[in-house]
Protein backbone atom coordinates (compact mmCIF):
# COMPACT_ATOMS: atom_id res chain seq x y z
CA UNK A 1 0.00 0.00 0.00
CA UNK A 2 1.27 3.49 -0.88
CA UNK A 3 2.71 5.51 2.02
CA UNK A 4 0.57 8.67 2.36
CA UNK A 5 3.57 10.49 3.86
CA UNK A 6 5.11 10.55 0.37
CA UNK A 7 1.86 11.62 -1.29
CA UNK A 8 -1.06 13.64 0.06
CA UNK A 9 0.55 14.08 3.50
CA UNK A 10 3.94 15.09 2.14
CA UNK A 11 3.72 18.56 3.71
CA UNK A 12 1.44 17.65 6.62
CA UNK A 13 4.05 17.98 9.39
CA UNK A 14 5.18 21.58 9.80
CA UNK A 15 8.13 21.08 12.17
CA UNK A 16 8.59 17.33 12.17
CA UNK A 17 8.71 14.14 10.15
CA UNK A 18 5.63 12.41 8.84
CA UNK A 19 5.21 8.86 10.05
CA UNK A 20 2.79 6.26 8.72
CA UNK A 21 1.75 3.45 11.04
CA UNK A 22 0.56 1.06 8.38
CA UNK A 23 -1.14 -1.59 10.53
CA UNK A 24 -3.48 1.09 11.92
CA UNK A 25 -3.50 3.30 8.81
CA UNK A 26 -2.52 6.28 10.93
CA UNK A 27 -0.59 9.32 9.77
CA UNK A 28 1.17 11.15 12.57
CA UNK A 29 4.13 13.45 13.11
CA UNK A 30 7.38 13.01 14.99
CA UNK A 31 7.95 16.58 16.10
CA UNK A 32 11.28 18.37 16.15
CA UNK A 33 12.54 19.51 19.55
CA UNK A 34 10.34 22.12 21.29
CA UNK A 35 7.46 21.63 18.84
CA UNK A 36 4.19 19.83 19.51
CA UNK A 37 0.62 19.48 18.28
CA UNK A 38 -1.00 17.30 15.65
CA UNK A 39 1.13 18.81 12.87
CA UNK A 40 4.03 19.98 15.08
CA UNK A 41 2.93 23.55 14.49
CA UNK A 42 2.90 24.70 18.10
CA UNK A 43 5.92 25.77 20.15
Amino acid sequence: KKNPCTAEFQNFCIHGECRYIEHLEVVTCNCHQDYFGERCGEK
Epitope: K1, G16, R19, I21, H23, L24, E25, V26, V27, T28, C29, N30, C31, F36, G37, E38
Partner: antibody, heavy 124, light 112 residues
Framework: EVQLVESGGGLVKPGGSLRLSCAAS????????MSWVRQAPEKGLEWVST????????YYPDSVKGRFTISRDNAKNSLYLQMNSLRAEDTAVYYC?????????????????WGQGTTVTVSS | DVVMTQSPLSLPVTLGDPASISCRSS???????????LHWYQQRPGQSPKLLIY???NRFDGVPDRFSGSGSGTDFTLKISRVEAEDVGVYYC?????????FGQGTKLEIK
Protein backbone atom coordinates in the same frame (compact mmCIF):
# COMPACT_ATOMS: atom_id res chain seq x y z
CA GLU B 1 -18.36 16.93 23.18
CA VAL B 2 -16.47 13.76 22.25
CA GLN B 3 -18.89 10.87 22.63
CA LEU B 4 -19.36 7.19 21.80
CA VAL B 5 -22.81 5.59 22.12
CA GLU B 6 -23.26 1.84 21.78
CA SER B 7 -26.49 0.06 20.85
CA GLY B 8 -27.72 -3.32 19.66
CA GLY B 9 -27.23 -5.41 22.80
CA GLY B 10 -29.87 -7.80 24.06
CA LEU B 11 -30.76 -11.37 24.91
CA VAL B 12 -29.83 -14.02 22.34
CA LYS B 13 -29.80 -17.83 22.36
CA PRO B 14 -26.54 -19.80 22.08
CA GLY B 15 -25.56 -20.11 18.43
CA GLY B 16 -27.41 -16.90 17.58
CA SER B 17 -26.18 -13.63 16.13
CA LEU B 18 -26.19 -9.98 17.13
CA ARG B 19 -24.88 -6.79 15.60
CA LEU B 20 -23.61 -4.03 17.84
CA SER B 21 -23.29 -0.43 16.70
CA CYS B 22 -21.33 2.51 18.05
CA ALA B 23 -22.16 6.07 17.03
CA ALA B 24 -19.27 8.52 17.32
CA SER B 25 -19.51 12.30 17.58
CA UNK B 26 -17.39 15.30 18.50
CA UNK B 27 -14.19 14.20 16.74
CA UNK B 28 -12.88 13.22 13.31
CA UNK B 29 -13.89 9.57 13.41
CA UNK B 30 -11.97 8.59 10.26
CA UNK B 31 -8.65 9.61 11.85
CA UNK B 32 -8.78 7.09 14.69
CA UNK B 33 -8.44 3.34 14.97
CA MET B 34 -11.35 1.95 17.01
CA SER B 35 -11.76 -0.99 19.36
CA TRP B 36 -14.32 -3.12 21.15
CA VAL B 37 -13.64 -4.24 24.73
CA ARG B 38 -15.95 -6.42 26.82
CA GLN B 39 -16.52 -7.06 30.50
CA ALA B 40 -18.24 -10.22 31.70
CA PRO B 41 -20.39 -9.88 34.85
CA GLU B 42 -18.17 -9.24 37.89
CA LYS B 43 -15.07 -9.84 35.75
CA GLY B 44 -12.25 -7.79 34.26
CA LEU B 45 -11.75 -6.18 30.85
CA GLU B 46 -11.10 -8.22 27.71
CA TRP B 47 -10.06 -6.76 24.36
CA VAL B 48 -12.33 -8.01 21.56
CA SER B 49 -11.24 -6.30 18.34
CA THR B 50 -9.49 -3.32 16.75
CA UNK B 51 -9.92 -1.83 13.28
CA UNK B 52 -7.60 0.55 11.44
CA UNK B 53 -8.72 4.04 10.37
CA UNK B 54 -9.73 3.03 6.85
CA UNK B 55 -10.99 -0.40 7.80
CA UNK B 56 -8.27 -2.26 5.88
CA UNK B 57 -6.81 -4.04 8.90
CA UNK B 58 -8.71 -5.84 11.65
CA TYR B 59 -7.44 -7.66 14.73
CA TYR B 60 -9.02 -10.20 17.09
CA PRO B 61 -8.04 -12.46 19.98
CA ASP B 62 -8.40 -16.21 19.44
CA SER B 63 -11.49 -16.26 21.68
CA VAL B 64 -13.60 -14.49 19.03
CA LYS B 65 -11.63 -14.98 15.81
CA GLY B 66 -13.82 -16.44 13.06
CA ARG B 67 -17.03 -15.60 14.93
CA PHE B 68 -16.87 -11.81 15.34
CA THR B 69 -16.33 -9.22 12.60
CA ILE B 70 -15.48 -5.57 13.25
CA SER B 71 -16.27 -2.97 10.59
CA ARG B 72 -16.72 0.77 10.26
CA ASP B 73 -18.51 3.32 8.10
CA ASN B 74 -16.52 6.55 8.21
CA ALA B 75 -19.20 8.41 6.26
CA LYS B 76 -21.68 7.59 9.03
CA ASN B 77 -19.20 7.95 11.93
CA SER B 78 -20.13 4.45 13.00
CA LEU B 79 -18.39 1.33 14.27
CA TYR B 80 -19.93 -2.15 14.20
CA LEU B 81 -19.39 -5.58 15.67
CA GLN B 82 -21.11 -8.52 14.00
CA MET B 83 -21.23 -11.41 16.47
CA ASN B 84 -22.10 -14.90 15.18
CA SER B 85 -22.16 -18.36 16.80
CA LEU B 86 -22.60 -16.73 20.19
CA ARG B 87 -21.74 -18.67 23.34
CA ALA B 88 -22.68 -18.27 26.99
CA GLU B 89 -19.14 -17.01 27.66
CA ASP B 90 -19.76 -14.06 25.32
CA THR B 91 -22.21 -12.63 27.87
CA ALA B 92 -20.79 -9.23 28.82
CA VAL B 93 -21.06 -5.48 28.61
CA TYR B 94 -19.49 -4.46 25.29
CA TYR B 95 -17.68 -1.12 25.16
CA CYS B 96 -16.73 0.83 22.08
CA UNK B 97 -13.42 2.69 22.57
CA UNK B 98 -11.34 5.15 20.58
CA UNK B 99 -7.75 4.06 20.07
CA UNK B 100 -6.05 7.12 21.47
CA UNK B 101 -4.85 10.47 20.17
CA UNK B 102 -2.22 10.33 17.46
CA UNK B 103 -0.34 13.52 18.25
CA UNK B 104 3.41 13.78 18.91
CA UNK B 105 4.03 10.47 17.21
CA UNK B 106 2.44 8.70 20.20
CA UNK B 107 -0.13 6.82 18.18
CA UNK B 108 -0.95 4.47 21.06
CA UNK B 109 -2.06 6.62 23.95
CA UNK B 110 -4.32 3.76 24.90
CA UNK B 111 -8.09 3.84 24.64
CA UNK B 112 -8.88 7.40 25.59
CA UNK B 113 -12.64 7.62 24.96
CA TRP B 114 -15.12 4.92 25.99
CA GLY B 115 -18.84 4.52 25.48
CA GLN B 116 -21.30 3.65 28.23
CA GLY B 117 -21.50 0.03 27.04
CA THR B 118 -24.26 -2.22 25.75
CA THR B 119 -25.20 -5.50 27.45
CA VAL B 120 -25.18 -8.80 25.57
CA THR B 121 -26.70 -11.84 27.28
CA VAL B 122 -26.35 -15.26 25.68
CA SER B 123 -28.71 -17.72 27.32
CA SER B 124 -31.25 -20.36 26.38
CA ASP C 1 -0.33 -14.10 24.49
CA VAL C 2 1.15 -11.60 26.95
CA VAL C 3 -0.15 -12.29 30.44
CA MET C 4 -0.52 -9.24 32.69
CA THR C 5 -0.39 -10.00 36.41
CA GLN C 6 -1.47 -7.38 38.93
CA SER C 7 -0.94 -7.32 42.68
CA PRO C 8 -2.56 -6.91 45.04
CA LEU C 9 -6.02 -7.77 43.73
CA SER C 10 -7.61 -6.00 46.70
CA LEU C 11 -6.21 -2.82 48.22
CA PRO C 12 -7.83 -1.34 51.35
CA VAL C 13 -6.39 2.15 51.98
CA THR C 14 -6.96 4.86 54.55
CA LEU C 15 -7.94 8.25 53.13
CA GLY C 16 -4.84 10.40 52.67
CA ASP C 17 -2.46 7.44 52.64
CA PRO C 18 -0.40 6.39 49.62
CA ALA C 19 -1.26 3.35 47.50
CA SER C 20 0.76 1.27 45.07
CA ILE C 21 -0.27 -1.31 42.47
CA SER C 22 2.17 -3.62 40.70
CA CYS C 23 1.77 -4.96 37.16
CA ARG C 24 4.06 -7.56 35.61
CA SER C 25 4.00 -8.77 32.01
CA SER C 26 5.03 -12.24 30.85
CA UNK C 27 7.29 -10.69 28.20
CA UNK C 28 8.89 -7.35 27.47
CA UNK C 29 6.53 -4.57 26.39
CA UNK C 30 9.26 -2.62 24.58
CA UNK C 31 8.63 -2.58 20.85
CA UNK C 32 11.15 -2.39 17.99
CA UNK C 33 11.27 1.40 18.20
CA UNK C 34 11.95 1.41 21.93
CA UNK C 35 8.41 2.45 22.88
CA UNK C 36 6.54 0.79 25.74
CA UNK C 37 2.78 0.62 25.35
CA LEU C 38 1.71 -0.01 28.93
CA HIS C 39 -1.37 1.89 30.12
CA TRP C 40 -3.43 2.18 33.28
CA TYR C 41 -7.22 2.50 33.42
CA GLN C 42 -9.53 3.42 36.26
CA GLN C 43 -13.07 2.07 36.48
CA ARG C 44 -15.23 3.65 39.15
CA PRO C 45 -18.25 1.68 40.40
CA GLY C 46 -21.01 1.60 37.77
CA GLN C 47 -18.94 3.55 35.22
CA SER C 48 -17.01 2.87 32.02
CA PRO C 49 -13.22 2.60 32.23
CA LYS C 50 -11.17 5.78 31.88
CA LEU C 51 -7.61 6.20 30.66
CA LEU C 52 -5.41 7.27 33.56
CA ILE C 53 -1.79 6.79 32.46
CA TYR C 54 -0.52 6.10 28.95
CA UNK C 55 2.85 4.75 27.86
CA UNK C 56 4.05 3.86 31.37
CA UNK C 57 4.25 7.32 32.94
CA ASN C 58 2.23 9.93 31.06
CA ARG C 59 -0.84 11.26 32.86
CA PHE C 60 -3.84 11.61 30.59
CA ASP C 61 -5.72 14.92 30.30
CA GLY C 62 -7.34 15.99 33.56
CA VAL C 63 -5.79 13.23 35.68
CA PRO C 64 -4.67 14.61 39.08
CA ASP C 65 -0.92 14.69 39.72
CA ARG C 66 -1.32 12.42 42.74
CA PHE C 67 -1.36 9.59 40.17
CA SER C 68 1.97 8.49 38.73
CA GLY C 69 3.23 5.58 36.68
CA SER C 70 6.68 4.07 36.44
CA GLY C 71 8.54 0.96 35.33
CA SER C 72 10.18 -0.61 32.31
CA GLY C 73 10.42 -3.86 30.39
CA THR C 74 8.14 -6.23 32.30
CA ASP C 75 7.70 -4.51 35.67
CA PHE C 76 5.39 -1.53 36.17
CA THR C 77 3.82 0.38 39.05
CA LEU C 78 0.90 2.76 39.54
CA LYS C 79 1.16 4.99 42.60
CA ILE C 80 -1.36 7.28 44.26
CA SER C 81 0.42 9.70 46.60
CA ARG C 82 -2.64 10.47 48.76
CA VAL C 83 -5.81 8.46 48.26
CA GLU C 84 -9.08 10.40 48.02
CA ALA C 85 -12.65 9.09 48.24
CA GLU C 86 -13.15 9.53 44.48
CA ASP C 87 -10.28 7.09 43.79
CA VAL C 88 -12.38 4.09 44.81
CA GLY C 89 -12.76 1.61 41.97
CA VAL C 90 -10.88 -1.00 39.98
CA TYR C 91 -7.52 -0.26 38.34
CA TYR C 92 -6.33 -2.18 35.28
CA CYS C 93 -2.97 -2.26 33.58
CA UNK C 94 -3.04 -3.01 29.86
CA UNK C 95 -0.55 -3.55 27.08
CA UNK C 96 -0.93 -2.67 23.40
CA UNK C 97 2.61 -3.53 22.29
CA UNK C 98 1.62 -7.04 21.23
CA UNK C 99 -1.56 -8.36 19.59
CA UNK C 100 -3.71 -9.58 21.24
CA UNK C 101 -3.91 -6.58 23.56
CA UNK C 102 -4.30 -7.78 27.12
CA PHE C 103 -5.40 -6.43 30.50
CA GLY C 104 -4.44 -7.30 34.05
CA GLN C 105 -7.06 -8.89 36.31
CA GLY C 106 -7.74 -5.57 38.03
CA THR C 107 -7.00 -4.22 41.49
CA LYS C 108 -9.94 -3.14 43.62
CA LEU C 109 -9.12 -0.08 45.69
CA GLU C 110 -11.40 0.53 48.67
CA ILE C 111 -11.36 2.85 51.65
CA LYS C 112 -10.66 1.29 55.06
Amino acid sequence: EVQLVESGGGLVKPGGSLRLSCAASGFTFSSYPMSWVRQAPEKGLEWVSTISTGGTYTYYPDSVKGRFTISRDNAKNSLYLQMNSLRAEDTAVYYCARQGPIYYGNYYYGMDVWGQGTTVTVSS
Amino acid sequence: DVVMTQSPLSLPVTLGDPASISCRSSQSLVNQEGETYLHWYQQRPGQSPKLLIYKVSNRFDGVPDRFSGSGSGTDFTLKISRVEAEDVGVYYCSQSTHVPYTFGQGTKLEIK
